[in-house]
């Protein structure tokens, strides 16, 4: 979480951003909030990135202002128009690109005062895992798969009996890169696996982490996962 | 659930004052304005001022300039709307409605005040 | 100030009527416009906002549409519960005004 001020005294007013991650070819959200004023058409809400000459996006009058914005951002960006008066400037990023990572700055004029706060964008691809029973193999198999990771993440295997094992030595992990030439399939193989027993798939990079579970027991099969972004941080 | 809990009725002489609170719940009363809308008998909706209690910054509406008074206490959540010389013409419900998610989005129940002699 | 002219100031309309309550602000206020309906003796009711998105549990018969100056609310079929007050409010330029209201009477 980062807070900024703005100048001394009365003219400073508070303003927030959370650092994020941008998954690839999805739309992402850049959030800042900032103390609400109840004079919508004296709020500017202005992102700026760094290294970029252009504006990612204004907005002023309760409008868009879209004269000044960078050519990279050209019909991408997007503020919740309807969720300004109540101090929301958060950028919707549409179709987000690798080169969108970086430093932005979310800068805010209210008829209250002025203050802005960076902002770190990271940007990769990060999906759910999903495991199961590989009957095809020989022995008892588990097989993980995840269909876009970026940048390369790396696979542990962990087991609820076996608390601490390492099953580096019992699995296989291979990487095959996607049809768009960035992002990559992640698939890992367990081997060896006992019945009544719950195995954890996690896959991390420095963007996200997500696990994928298995409950294999005679009668059924029980299977869970999330994903956590990992820099989450307020400004 | 949010709610906003104004207190009860009053009844006043021409030139009096009268206070009306409102009590705020399941929203973060200080990081949001609260404003105060009054609706004369049989007439319609007039917006009077806000508060911004994490400031106390206020803004007035330019017919009630210097005869109202808004005050926040934010260990109670509880907004205060004061009104001096009181005329008969004051004889209205007065609500307290915040603007939390969007402009004016949850209301008080009203309080009802009536100035006769 | 920003004037709100609504019309019209009532209307006398049968259950399963289309009604159009039309709000004309005296300049742009940029979509900045909300719908409430009252009821007698009850605050007002928040029930759309942005011109034109439902507030939370308002029913799918209730729309809000329009740009520029001009604003409309439609109930697409009027039922027994939606005999009220309705009125507008612009909240682009500072003060907040609000429409004079439009009551909505049983034929």
């Known amino acids: 979480l980062i807070i900024g001020f703005g100048i001394s005294g009365r003219h400073s007013i508070t303003v927030t951003t959370v650092a994020s991650a941008g998954n690839i070819g999805e739309d992402g959200i850049l959030s800042c909030t900032f103390e609400p004023d109840i004079k919508l058409s004296d709020i500017v809400i202005q992102w700026l990135k760094e290294g970029v000459l252009g504006l990612v996006h204004e907005f002023k009058e309760g409008k868009d202002e879209l004269s000044e914005q960078d050519e990279m951002f050209r019909g991408r960006t997007a503020v919740f128009a309807d969720q300004v008066i109540v101090g929301n400037a958060s950028l919707r990023l549409k179709n987000v690109q690798l080169t969108d990572a970086g430093t932005y700055k979310c800068y805010i004029i209210t008829s209250k005062g002025k203050g802005n706060a960076n902002l770190e964008y990271k940007t990769g691809a990060f999906s759910m895992p999903e495991v199961n029973v590989d009957y095809n193999a020989s022995s008892e198999t588990l097989r993980c798969e995840a269909p876009r990771w970026f940048p390369q993440p790396t696979v542990v295997w962990a087991s609820q009996v076996d608390q601490g094992a390492n099953f580096s030595e019992v699995s296989n992990t291979s990487f095959e890169l996607n049809s768009e030439n960035v992002t990559m399939k992640v698939v890992s193989v367990l081997y060896n696996v006992t019945i009544n027993n719950t195995y954890s798939c996690m896959i991390e990079n420095d963007i996200a982490k997500a696990t994928g579970d298995i409950k294999v027991t005679e009668s059924e099969i029980k299977r869970r996962s999330h994903l956590q972004l990992l820099n989450s941080k307020a400004s | 659930q949010v709610q906003l809990v104004q207190s009860g009725a009053e009844v006043k002489k021409p030139g009096a004052s009268v206070k009306v609170s409102c009590k705020v719940s399941?929203?973060?009363?200080?990081?949001?304005?609260m404003h105060w809308v009054r609706q004369a008998p049989g007439q319609g909706l007039e917006w009077m001022g806000a508060i911004y209690p994490g400031k106390s910054d206020t803004e007035y509406a330019q017919k009630f300039q210097g005869r109202v008074t808004l005050t926040a206490d934010t260990s109670t959540s509880t907004a205060y709307m004061e009104l001096s010389s009181l005329r008969s013409e004051d004889t209205a419900v007065y609500y307290c409605?915040?603007?939390?998610?969007?402009?004016?989005?949850?209301w008080g129940q009203g309080t009802t005040v009536t100035v006769s002699s | 100030d920003i004037q709100m002219t609504q019309s019209p100031s009532s209307l006398s309309a049968s259950v399963g009527d289309r009604v159009t309550i039309t709000c004309q602000a005296t300049?742009?206020?940029?979509?900045?416009l909300n719908w409430y309906q009252q009821k007698p003796g009850k605050p007002p009711k928040f029930l759309i906002y942005?011109?034109?998105q439902l507030a939370e549990g308002v029913p799918s018969r209730f729309s809000g549409s329009g740009s520029g100056t001009d604003y409309t609310l439609t109930i697409s079929s009027l039922q027994s519960e939606d005999f009220a007050t309705y009125y507008c409010l612009q909240f682009y330029e500072f003060p907040p005004t609000f429409g004079g209201g439009t009551k909505v009477e049983i034929k």
């Open positions: 399941g929203y973060p009363f200080t990081s949001y304005w």
């Open positions: 300049q742009d206020i940029v979509k900045s």
């Open positions: 409605t915040s603007t939390w998610t969007h402009y004016f989005d949850y």
């Open positions: 942005y011109t034109a």
